[in-house]
Interface confidence: medium
Amino acid sequence: HNTTVFQGVEGQSLQVSCPYDSMKHWGRRKAWCRQLGEKGPCQRVVSTHNLWLLSFLRRRNGSTAITDDTLGGTLTITLRNLQPHDAGFYQCQSLHGSEADTLRKVLVEVLADPLDHRDAGDLWVPGESESFEDAHVEHSISRSLLEGEIPFPPTS
């Protein structure tokens, strides 16, 4: 799997999308996990509804929410009130029994808010030609600012 990069702005919401083959993954619940090391485990953050038919319902763990369009074949994860510690490696997974297939490997990068008094420097504008060896960049920034949101806490 190549790594897909999603970049968001501190304090705002970032939406991560993971497309998949809806027929191949029919009847399977999905999950979003955080990679804890290069070869380490992927720690579950949030998973879709226990009843697959209700996967379209949004489920939340702290500031992370997940919803699955099982017909269209798109898993959507929303990270609210993005903070520097949210930066890192994640995976979208398709669950079957105790196994999990990786749908997409994701790198989340967090930028300082360019409209804040802390200037972010030259903010990259989507559409500029960039060349990456093994990554695809998705610029996915929402302007909605949510106050007082508590980020998903790590577990040791």
Partner: antibody
């Protein structure tokens, strides 16, 4: 193994510029952002800013805004930090540091580059 | 900006002692705190991240605790190689900020 190797010590006059390099090896360069952190003699650590190795996006500390520029060269897996209009209080050891999997902390550091600003 | 204040600024201890260093944030940073060890002329080394998670390869005598604004680094039984400066760092919000450091000296 992961390594960040920085360029050598520099002596500069006030008002001049300095450009420090940080060559990364042992990992996929574009998968990790690099921060620059400096440490004045006998002082604590000061975060200067961060650059995305993917596309050169930057976040700079406000106090250095306008004087600092961070760039990357993916062909050589090298990150550069240029500081302009040097003052005596810019005398410090400058470190590059990789932001790893560990929730916004820095898991690998360069050996440091001493920049001395003196007339 | 979030200010990080460490105490004490220096501490003297002997091999085998239990040592505690504290770090206080000027506002709530949840659990987004890291601890580093730095020896003279060397780069910092990551010990603890996310307040209490031990970085791979770091001896288990090091431990971290706390959340919100008050955090603690504990060395359960000091070894000769532990004499160094210890710094905390918050990653809750930009700009990233560090404590001023705590120097651990041989008594």
């Amino acid at each position: 193994q992961v390594q960040l190797v920085q360029s050598g010590a520099e002596v500069k006059k006030p008002g001049a510029s300095v450009k420090v390099s940080c060559k990364a090896s042992g990992y996929t360069f574009t998968n990790y952002g690099i921060s620059w952190v400096r440490q004045a003699p006998g002082q604590g650590l000061e975060w200067m800013g961060w650059i995305s190795a993917y596309n050169g996006n930057t976040n700079y500390a406000q106090k250095l805004q306008g004087r600092v520029t961070m760039t990357t060269d993916t062909s050589t897996s090298t990150v550069y930090m240029e500081l302009r209009s040097l003052r005596s209080d810019d005398t410090a050891v400058y470190y590059c540091a990789r932001r790893g999997y560990s929730y916004g902390s820095f898991d690998y550091w360069g050996q440091g580059t001493l920049v001395t600003v003196s007339s | 900006d979030i200010q990080m204040t460490q105490s004490p600024s220096s501490v003297s201890a002997s091999v085998g002692d239990r040592v505690t260093v504290t770090c206080r944030a000027s506002q709530d940073i949840n659990s987004w705190l890291a601890w580093y060890q730095q020896k003279p002329g060397k780069a910092p080394k990551l010990l603890i991240y996310a307040a209490s998670s031990l970085q791979t390869g770091v001896p288990s005598r090091f431990s971290g605790s706390g959340s919100g604004t008050d955090f603690t680094l504990t060395i359960s039984s000091l070894q000769p190689e532990d004499f160094a400066t210890y710094s905390c760092q918050q990653s809750n919000s930009f700009p990233i900020t560090f404590g001023q450091g705590t120097r651990l000296e041989i008594k």
